[in-house]
Amino acid sequence: SGPVKELVGSVGGAVTFPLKSKVKQVDSIVWTFNTTPLVTIQPEGGTIIVTQNRNRERVDFPDGGYSLKLSKLKKNDSGIYYVGIYSSSLQQPSTQEYVLHVYEHLSKPKVTMGLQSNKNGTCVTNLTCCMEHGEEDVIYTWKALGQAANESHNGSILPISWRWGESDMTFICVARNPVSRNFSSPILARKLCEGAADDPDSSMV
């Protein structure tokens, strides 16, 4: 029995739970998901029983091996998977535990602008990046592209200080999770500061 294996999958995608055994006479292999039986295999008997019929089309065994491939992943497939290999040649079953995290492919992040001040020819505000559907485990970074130097900023909130007359800057939010990344629409400092003069608490996509 090895350490817990962490696996990552994306909604609609597939994941393979790796499993190898050097046991000659495997009587049965039992896979469970959050304590619910998922699949029972009897290699010598040639039978594979998928407990819930709706999972039959999602279960496969690549190259006829012991590893289990689960496809058409859904968010609620996230959880703990456990496999036991039972054999008369083993005093106790050989076991392995897996933790699966299923993530959605990220949609375009939304950017909102906080209160803005225009003092001494300098436009000061915050841009906040967020996912509309509250996706989990999202990491945000900002890219600030200008003529001088390109800068990166970690976190969902980007403080901006832009002086009128300086070369224009472009801000892009990058949202990442373990399976995908997506970009906000680019935001130009000049446009942002012009628009904000009229509407001090505005939002943009």
Partner: antibody
Amino acid sequence: QMQLVQSGAEVKKTGSSVKVSCKASGYTFTSSWMNWVRQAPGQALEWMGRIYPGDGDTKYNGKFKGRVTITRDRSMSTAYMELSSLRSEDTAMYYCARSTMIATGAMDYWGQGTLVTVSS
Amino acid sequence: EIVLTQSPATLSLSPGERATLSCKASQDVSTAVAWYQQKPGLAPRLLIYSASYRYTGIPDRFSGSGSGTDFTLTISRLEPEDFAVYYCQQHYSTPPYTFGPGTKVDIK
């Protein structure tokens, strides 16, 4: 990649023996059952027996009444099938075939075949 | 010994048509049936094992079904390369494993 390469064609006399070899590569030879299957000209497939290369355990089709012996050489990753007391009806293509792990009676990789012709 | 019977012996169809091949076992073999494709001069190729599990790399136009004594291999839309002989095999419990006599799928 996974490959099973068999020895060349044989022409044998009635009453003699033939030994066919099957060299495995691209996978762990000792961890999968190796089967032998034959096919007479224009006929169906016939399972002869199998060996577990890890420990040499064998299982045979009773039809061959002790005429077939399957062995292996672990150091050479090679399996052998010997058929004795040959008769004309043993003229056939002989295949070695690896068992899948998940269903040990299903065979996923096959050798190219060895034609054995028995003549009087 | 478990005896497998395949029908029809020959199936004459055109490319694009659906092929349905039958295999009957003389006794209950649960879901332990495999299907193979064989072309002239070549070794058999595993298509399906445990009645309905497609082997890696096999196109999804091939599907298997059945349990107990009645099994079916379906080719949803025949491609030119699918014209061949198809064998069912029972791989239930202890050997000997047995094969059916085969169904030849040829071009109409």
